[in-house]
């Protein structure tokens, strides 16, 4: 019995279906086919879970969180024992193993391994201003998304004709910050932060209005 090489890893957007491949060759009839799919979740590597089981001509549910979402892609028994997972969740990320036994065919590689990564587009980030908006001050524009896998990068732009940040601005696209030194009236305006990763983008808006000093009455 020989389980074929798997593609190594699969990426899928949260909520979308995933197919985890596992095929094998065997010299014996499929009368005593036994297939166990297991997962070692990324979130809890010490706690492997059963995903689905085929034994004695019957299918059995695995861990409760997979109930109603998992099945074999084809009619069993078969040499293609790939499974689907519907409505993928972040917690489905992990290393999946198919363990195949088909007595009396023993020997060879009977395990296939596939990694599953569930990707999440960035949630709309939160935009905020840190520091005084008085003319001449330094301000930091902050942008961060609560969700996003892979981790989002952040691009700030000023929504004027150029989309360029003021010349005194420095941007950190990993942290999502823009530091604007010595703000002036020209720093005023609407800024947009774009959070993006491999599968999506989202945005937030921030209105920076630099406060000019009020003229003082002398008298």
């Amino acid at each position: 019995l020989e389980v074929s090489e798997s593609p190594g890893s699969i990426q899928v957007a949260r909520g979308q279906p995933a197919v985890l491949p596992c095929t094998f060759t065997t010299s014996a009839a499929l009368i005593n086919l036994n297939v166990i799919w297991m997962v070692t979740p990324l979130s809890n590597a010490n706690q492997p879970e059963q995903v689905i089981l085929y034994q004695g001509g019957q299918m059995f549910d695995g861990a409760p969180r997979f109930h109603g979402r998992v099945g074999f892609t084809g009619t069993m028994p078969a040499t293609n024992v790939s499974i689907f997972i519907n409505n993928t969740q972040l917690s489905d990320t992990g290393t999946y193993q198919c363990l195949v036994n088909n007595l009396p065919d023993i020997g060879g590689r009977n395990i296939g391994v596939t990694g599953l990564t569930v990707l999440v587009p960035p949630s709309a980030p939160h935009c905020q201003i840190q520091g005084s908006q008085d003319i001449g001050s330094d301000v930091i524009l902050l942008c961060s998304s609560e969700e996003g896998i892979p981790r989002p990068t952040y691009l700030w732009e000023k929504l004027d004709n150029t989309l360029k940040l003021p010349p005194t601005a420095t941007q950190d696209q990993v942290q999502g910050t823009v530091t604007i030194r010595n703000i002036s009236a020209l720093s005023s305006g609407l800024y947009q932060c774009v959070a993006s990763n491999a599968i999506g983008t989202s945005t937030c808006l921030l209105d920076l209005q630099v406060i000019s000093p009020q003229p003082r009455n002398i008298g």
Epitope: P121, A124, L159, L190, Q192, T201, S202, L205, D207, Q209
Partner: antibody, heavy 121, light 107 residues
Framework: EVQLLESGGGLVQPGGSLRLSCAAS????????MSWVRQAPGKGLEWVSA????????YYADSVKGRFTISRDNSKNTLYLQMNSLRAEDTAAYYC??????????????WSQGTLVTVSS | DIQMTQSPSSLSASVGDRVTITCRAS??????LNWYQQKPGKAPKLLIY???SLQSGVPSRFSGSGSGTDFTLTISSLQPEDFATYYC?????????FGQGTKVEIK
């Protein structure tokens, strides 16, 4: 009481110009960003343009960029929309709207009653 | 641009009914969502801001919920003055965009 009263609508030929005005009262006009939103007959709402409280920053929808100019006169508590090179698809009721203060840029908390602009030959 | 899709486009209901209107954004907009009511020949009126906050002076039978991409406006017990068109609007990104509207009619 917040009030927004606009004027200047009417019938204009394609390619023509029109200037809408919106007189504001009941709040500190210069402290609020203002906006224009339009609604074609029987259709939904479309944001057109916005301007910061000081008048130093202006924003436009792609559909009007280069043709419309938003401005304000804080001494007169008045918002303007200069519309040039008008097209049939600009036919709509035009509303001026106040934007909520602070971090809520883009929330329209008070609206005018609207003025109809008809572009037709 | 962020697309806003409302459903249904129209509905018929009776006074006292519970009415639910949904709004879906083409990308996550967190809670940067507003709801407006517009009666024929009148200006829109802000009902709900920040997805779930009731604007001052708006009756408590109106409520909003949701975050991310899916949002709901609920009228707990429809009153005669509630027959109107309702619009959602996002302020997460530029340009600001509205849903196409949901017309609530008398059954």
């Amino acid at each position: 009481e917040v009030q927004l009263l606009e004027s200047g609508g009417g019938l204009v030929q394609p390619g023509g110009s029109l200037r809408l005005s919106c007189a504001a009262s009941g709040f500190t006009f210069s402290s609020y960003a203002m906006s224009w939103v339009r609604q074609a007959p029987g259709k939904g709402l479309e944001w057109v343009s916005a301007i910061s409280g000081s008048g130093g920053s202006t924003y436009y929808a792609d559909s009007v960029k280069g043709r419309f100019t938003i401005s304000r006169d804080n001494s007169k508590n008045t918002l303007y929309l200069q519309m040039n090179s008008l097209r049939a698809e600009d036919t709509a009721a035009y509303y001026c709207a106040r934007m909520a203060a602070g971090a809520s840029w883009g929330t329209f908390d008070y609206w005018s009653q609207g003025t109809l602009v008809t572009v037709s030959s | 641009d962020i697309q806003m899709t409302q459903s249904p486009s129209s509905l018929s209901a009776s006074v006292g009914d519970r009415v639910t209107i949904t709004c879906r954004a083409s990308q996550s907009i967190s809670s940067y969502l507003n709801w407006y009511q517009q009666k024929p020949g009148k200006a829109p009126k802000l009902l709900i801001y920040a997805a779930s906050s009731l604007q001052s002076g708006v009756p408590s039978r109106f409520s909003g919920s949701g975050s991310g991409t899916d949002f709901t406006l609920t009228i707990s017990s429809l009153q005669p003055e509630d027959f109107a068109t309702y619009y959602c609007q996002q302020r997460s990104g530029s340009p600001l965009t509205f849903g196409q509207g949901t017309k609530v009619e008398i059954k």
